[in-house]
Interface confidence: medium
């Protein structure tokens, strides 16, 4: 009869390497008498005999993990006990080996230049995979801006345009290599103005081209603003090359303005804009005798529309920054004040003021205003508006009407050309062509070029002294 013998583990457990989903077996060979009871633990926790993931055979000496999972990693021990002596134990590690697997692959990214981009690449594998990145067809080199994090993610600080491209991450260990799909890194660039429009100081009627060049990704759109509003006139030409948009605004300059170039592009739901402004000013016309101090154009205002001849070309004085607006403002101010004058004076004064402020242009190719004939000026002064004119003279020779902003010049009759000398050198006010005693009504007021016939009007000399500077506003 055999003598009792305490258990001896003749084959200690060894470290077992196993691939996921494969079988892993620990062998615990025991010699003893009587036959021992063998139990198994994993990480000090007893493996239950009825756990279907395990198979325990050969009287408990063989433990088989039927389909290894990543979580099966750990220390496995067999404990043998037959009641003779103490229990004996042998332990070994299960190292779950895993080909690299990319658990969180990178995705397409749109990022604004200058920001930080992170392309994820989370991996699994045993041994732990090393992660590298490929850009296009080449291995990506790390530098002060570009780093592969411990997690495997690619971090790019201060993203530049040249960082744009196709990327993939590569996870590699001794068991194999895994590649992510190609992803695209798109670098968006805030709209930026490369070339701002230049300010110009030009003469009235010049053509000016304002040029604005902008860059951005996506390519920006360029819009132009004139004095805070969309540009109402001028032609815009645009071209795009290498993500640079070149916009040229051609203007026909009739008034000064602030022109703003606005470059805009979209980043997701947000927009980025860049602005640059240029002024177009109208040069002071030099006082040399070659410079006409204005230009001739059709009257486009409202105040004198019924007074001036239809389609007449009138003279606009470029000593004003914006002649047409300035002259219209002057006449508008005066017009309101004329409400106070007598019904006899008012239409005559309106005709005089309109034809004086908007003098007819003499025919020809160089702009020259044609003043009112002296005789018609005197008719208004001494006949139609005698009472008002005297009252005006009494107000310190500064004019009946003041707005504080402008002083409207009333013509000094004595300085106007006489139609007796040259009927073609001045403008007449035809509705005044009546004898004094016949003036009871006022026909529609239009001005015209004088003809040779001389109206029955006051003599060219004034019956009282004319002050050197009359003005109305």
């Amino acid at each position: 009869e055999k003598l009792p013998k305490a258990p001896v583990i003749t084959t200690p457990l060894e470290t077992v390497d196993a691939l996921v989903e494969e079988v892993a077996t620990f062998m615990c060979a025991v010699e003893s008498y009587p036959q021992p009871e063998i139990s198994w633990t994993r990480n000090k926790i007893l493996i239950k005999l009825f756990d279907t993931r395990y198979s325990i055979r050969e009287n408990g000496q063989l433990l088989t993990i039927l389909s290894v999972e990543d979580s099966d990693d750990g220390i496995y021990c067999c404990i043998a006990n037959n009641g003779v002596g103490g229990a004996v134990e042998s332990c070994g590690a299960l190292q779950v080996k895993m080909k690299p697997k990319i658990t969180r692959p990178p995705i397409n990214v749109k990022i604004i230049e200058g920001l930080k981009a992170v392309l994820p690449c989370t991996t699994m594998g045993n041994p732990k995979p090393s992660v590298s990145w490929i850009k296009g067809d080449n291995a990506l080199r790390e530098n002060s801006r570009i780093a592969v994090l411990e997690s495997g993610s690619l971090r790019i600080h201060n993203v530049q345009k040249e960082d744009a491209g196709q990327y993939r991450c590569v996870a590699k260990n001794s068991l194999g290599t895994a590649y992510s799909k190609l992803v695209k890194l798109e670098v968006e660039v805030f709209a930026r103005i490369l070339r701002a429009p230049e300010s110009h100081n030009v003469t009235f009627g010049s053509f000016v081209t304002l040029r604005c060049t902008a860059i951005g990704i996506p390519v920006p759109t360029i819009s132009w603003i004139e004095n805070g509003n969309a540009v109402s006139s001028g032609s815009i030409q645009e071209s795009v090359k290498d993500r640079v948009i070149d916009s040229r605004l051609q203007l026909f300059i009739t008034k000064p303005g602030l022109y703003t170039c606005i470059a805009t592009n979209k980043h997701g739901e947000k927009f980025s804009t860049a602005k640059a402004a240029a002024t177009v000013s109208i040069a002071e016309w030099s006082k040399s005798q070659k410079d006409s101090q204005g230009y001739c154009a059709q009257y486009r205002g409202e105040v004198c529309d019924a007074v001036l001849a239809k389609d007449a070309l009138v003279f606009f004085n470029t000593s004003y920054r914006d002649p047409e607006d300035a002259q219209e403002l002057l006449i508008h101010t005066a017009w309101n004040e004329l409400k106070a004058v007598s019904p006899l004076c008012r239409p005559a004064a309106e005709a005089l003021l309109c034809n004086h402020l908007f003098q007819e242009c003499s025919p020809g190719v160089v702009p020259t205003p044609m003043p009112i004939c002296r005789e018609y000026c005197l008719a208004v002064k001494e006949l139609f508006c005698a009472k008002e004119w005297q009252a005006m003279e009494g107000k310190a020779h500064r004019g009946l009407y003041r707005s504080g902003m402008h002083l409207l010049p009333v013509p000094e009759c004595s300085k106007l050309p006489s139609m007796h000398r040259d009927p073609t050198a001045c403008t007449r006010l035809p509705y005044l062509d009546y004898k004094k005693e016949n003036i009871t009504t006022f026909p529609s007021i239009t001005s015209s070029r004088p003809s040779a016939d001389i109206p029955n009007l006051p003599a060219s000399t004034s019956s009282f002294a004319v002050s050197p500077a009359y003005s109305m506003t």
């Epitope: 003469t203 009235f204 009627g205 010049s206 053509f207 006139s233 032609s235 051609q250 026909f252 009739t254 005798q289 070659k290 006409s292 204005g294 230009y295 001739c296 154009a297 059709q298 389609d311 070309l313 242009c361 025919p363 020809g364 190719v365 160089v366 702009p367 020259t368």
Partner: antibody
Framework: QVQLQESGPGLVKPSETLSLTCTVS????????WSWIRQPPGKGLEWIGY???????YYNPSLKSRVTISVDTSKNQFSLKLSSVTAADTAVYYC??????????????WGQGTLVTVSS | SYELTQPPSVSVSPGQTARITCSGD??????AYWYQQKPGQAPVLVIY???ERPSGIPERFSGSSSGTTVTLTISGVQAEDEADYYC???????????FGGGTKLTVL
């Protein structure tokens, strides 16, 4: 970029009326002055007249009795009619922008010109 | 009728300076404008208001005015500058436009 293009018959009989049209492209005819200028073969330039977009015209005094310039803003065109032509009116006829009343007293740009021959 | 007088021809070697004059009684009062015309082509504005140069015109083109004479100066003349040059101005009353008879510039 404003461009001008003259069109019309290249041959006109003496005593008849020469008619040419200038089409403006790349910009509006409005707000500008538009001129006709001619150049007899081998000779210098002669200004014929201008028209403002509103229809206001002014002509070279030496040609005034025979010249009519008109404008069609809807078509962006202006036209020249020169009546009672003689062989002396044989020339290259140019249309150009400018030439009037202080708003661009110079001529720029020009059309490429069209040769009109007066001959029976 | 009013006239502007130009020399019929001016010759100059490449790199030299060419000066073309234009005389007229009204030139102290009226601006002059200069045009370049090459054979078979329309004239091109090279100087306006006596001395202003349009954009796109080389800096070698300049203009000046003195009394009844205006002058177009082309410094460092190039072969491509060979052309006819015309001055334009108005009569003294500004009634109509007049062109000079033209000057043929020959680059030797």
């Amino acid at each position: 970029q404003v461009q001008l293009q003259e069109s019309g018959p290249g041959l006109v009989k003496p005593s008849e009326t020469l008619s040419l049209t200038c089409t403006v492209s790349g910009g509006s005819i409005s707000s500008y002055y538009w001129s006709w200028i001619r150049q007899p073969p081998g000779k210098g330039l002669e200004w014929i007249g201008y028209i403002y977009f509103s229809g206001r015209t002014y002509y070279n005094p030496s040609l005034k009795s025979r010249v009519t310039i008109s404008v069609d803003t809807s078509k962006n065109q202006f036209s020249l009619k020169l009546s009672s032509v003689t062989a002396a009116d044989t020339a290259v006829y140019y249309c150009a922008r400018g030439g009037g009343l202080g708003i661009s007293n110079w001529f720029d740009p020009w059309g490429q010109g069209t040769l009109v021959t007066v001959s029976s | 009728s009013y006239e502007l007088t130009q020399p019929p021809s001016v010759s100059v070697s490449p790199g030299q300076t060419a000066r073309i004059t234009c005389s007229g009684d009204a030139l102290p009062k009226q601006y002059a404008y200069w045009y370049q015309q090459k054979p078979g082509q329309a004239p091109v504005l090279v100087i306006y208001k006596d001395s202003e140069r349009p954009s796109g015109i080389p800096e070698r083109f300049s203009g000046s005015s003195s009394g009844t004479t205006v002058t177009l100066t082309i410094s460092g003349v190039q072969a491509e500058d060979e052309a006819d040059y015309y001055c334009q101005s108005a009569d003294s009353s500004g009634t109509y436009w007049v062109f000079g008879g033209g000057t043929k510039l020959t680059v030797l």
